[in-house]
Interface confidence: low
């Protein structure tokens, strides 16, 4: 049987289930690496308060559609008096990057997983030549996850004080420069994540080859290196290679980009500071409100929920979009689509799409930026669910009582981009981290 | 002492709605994993929706689209709101809290009944 999702195969995944202190290992092709898990256990369940392992999803007992992956295993369990048998469950949705398997909940019997990843997109437009996992768990099971850094196009330039040549990176990926072609990337040889820039020259000084890994608790190293033996001439026989450090900073501040701090050989060593190395829930929140000793911030949104089925309103060209963020109303004319985010065709308002559900609602502050995020839209047709990204800006004479109002400014790939002038974004820090 | 209680459960019309809640006292709310079951006569217990501490939602196939599980902390209740109902919804519901420090706790079901 061939591998469902082959893109997913050559890594052993982790995801954590927090409030039970769980961590599970994941080989969807083939059998993690844990002894105690029995040699083919595709989910191992490691317990860590008790310190034992359990497989809960074997690799043979393996079975999958376009979405769905289920791993059986023969340990019986006790559901309601039922002959039951362990088993995890892992759904997956098309996304732009490969993601993350996230846990969901666990019954008696069956361990639940989400996965929004490229590799379950009926169209391969968001696919990488090269991707690997970018996202890692600490020692206290806390999750630093970089997607929000990936690029689909285009690249970070790093702050370097050569005047001579210019560096480039994406973050886990390869630079993509078929869908953005800058210029200076355009010369960027395929599969480069870290392209050095020189005159009309390009030069690949690096691939992703392994995850993100954790050197301590706020500090994530990515490594990139040339896969190709042929070596450049102006690196006096050393092959290229690139390590980026990324620094959670000790206090809330503004983002800022990566920098060179040596070079040797060839050698790049970059840093970079950006909130999005520290755990995420210092970063986000399921509610439209992110406070307490965690966050070091107070952020309140929820006075931009409409009642009595009123919507904010945003003109998109073609379209309308009916807005009710942070709360469970309805949006009359959204069809009980629980939408947060609904498009409506001007031409034809009997088409309708939900752009973004009010249940799977995300608030991120890192950086500086403050977004909510509504995913879980109605599918595109390249089986990417429409999702809609709201920035917010500090205003305090914004208008409407302080609230503001959205304005649309553009979609790619079925991901709608909006900004909003509030009061109510008007972030107030602490000061302890 | 720990105990939940269900209330919101009647007899309904297909394609109805009703409100299920499940008040929590004894223990920290907040806290805790928060699932609605269901028991059909003569089925077996199944499992309807979750709502994890941390906010994650998750649904049944049979239920997805029409459920909606939320919270309110503040009054330590959790909520299952049911829009278009079929017969097949007939059922005890159940709900039971999860958390890492205590056993399961159950609470003793409210009845729903959908028919014309």
């Known amino acids: 049987q061939a591998a469902p999702f082959p893109e997913l195969c050559s890594y052993t995944w982790e995801a954590v289930d927090t409030k039970n202190n769980v961590l599970y290992k994941i080989n969807i092709c083939g059998s993690v690496d844990i002894v105690q898990c029995g040699p083919s256990s595709a989910v191992c369940m490691h317990l860590l308060k008790t310190r034992t392992y359990h497989s809960v999803g074997d690799s043979v007992l393996r079975s999958a559609t376009r979405s769905l992956l289920e791993f059986n295993t023969t340990v019986s369990c006790d559901q309601q008096g039922t002959n039951h048998r362990v088993q995890s469950s892992i759904a997956f949705l098309c996304g732009k990057t490969l993601g993350t398997p996230e846990f969901v909940t666990a019954t008696e019997c069956v361990h639940y997983f989400e996965w929004r990843t490229t590799a379950a997109c009926k169209k391969d437009i968001f696919k990488a030549n090269k991707e690997v996992p970018c996202y890692v768990f600490d020692e206290e099971l806390r999750k630093h996850d970089l997607n929000p850094l990936i690029k689909l196009s285009g690249a970070y330039l790093v702050d370097d004080s050569d005047p001579d040549t210019s560096l480039f990176i994406n973050v886990c990926r390869d630079i993509d420069t078929l869908r953005d072609p800058g210029s200076q990337l355009r010369a960027c040889p395929p599969g480069t994540a870290a392209c050095l820039v020189r005159g009309h020259q390009a030069f690949d000084v690096g691939q992703p080859r392994d995850g993100l890994k954790v050197v301590r608790k706020d500090r994530l190293v990515l490594s990139y290196v040339r896969e190709e033996a042929g070596k450049l001439d102006f690196c006096d026989g050393h092959s290229p290679a690139v390590t980026i450090t990324f620094v959670c900073p000790s206090e809330r501040r503004e983002g800022t980009i990566p920098k060179l701090t040596a070079k040797s050989n060839c050698r790049y060593e970059i840093e970079w500071i950006t909130e999005y190395a520290c755990h995420r829930d210092y970063l986000e929140s399921k509610t439209c409100s992110l406070s307490g000793e965690q966050q070091d911030v107070s952020i309140d949104l929820t006075p931009l929920a409409q009642s009595g089925g009123s919507s904010y309103i945003s003109d998109g060209k073609e379209y309308l979009f009916y807005l009710n963020v942070c709360g469970e109303t309805e949006i009359q004319f959204c069809n009980k689509k629980q939408a947060a985010v609904c498009q409506v065709k001007k031409s034809d308002t009997s088409q309708v799409k939900a752009a973004g559900r009010y249940h799977n609602q995300t608030l991120r502050y890192s950086d500086g930026d403050l977004t909510l995020i509504y995913f879980g839209g109605d599918e595109c047709s390249s089986g990417f669910q429409r999702m809609s990204v709201i920035n917010f800006e500090c205003n305090k004479t914004a208008g409407n009582d302080g609230k503001g109002t959205p304005v649309f400014t553009g979609e790619v790939d079925c991901t709608y981009f909006f900004t909003w002038d509030t009061e109510y974004a008007c972030v107030h820090h602490h000061h302890h981290h | 002492d720990v105990q939940l209680v269900e209330s919101g459960g009647g007899l309904v019309q297909p394609g109805g709605s009703l409100r299920l809640s499940c008040a929590a006292s004894g223990i920290i709310f907040s806290d805790n994993r928060m699932d609605w079951y269901r028991q059909a006569p003569g089925k077996q217990r199944e499992w309807v929706a979750t709502?994890?501490?941390?906010?994650?939602?998750t649904y049944a196939d049979s239920v997805k689209g029409r459920f909606t599980i939320s919270r309110d902390n503040a009054k330590n209740t959790v909520y299952l709101q049911m829009n278009s109902l079929r017969p097949e919804d007939t059922a005890v519901y159940y709900c039971?809290?999860?958390?890492?420090?205590?056993?399961?706790?159950w609470g003793q079901g409210t009845l729903v009944t959908v028919s014309s």
């Open positions: 039971k809290a999860s958390s890492p420090v205590l056993n399961d706790i």
């Open positions: 709502l994890a501490s941390y906010g994650w939602k």
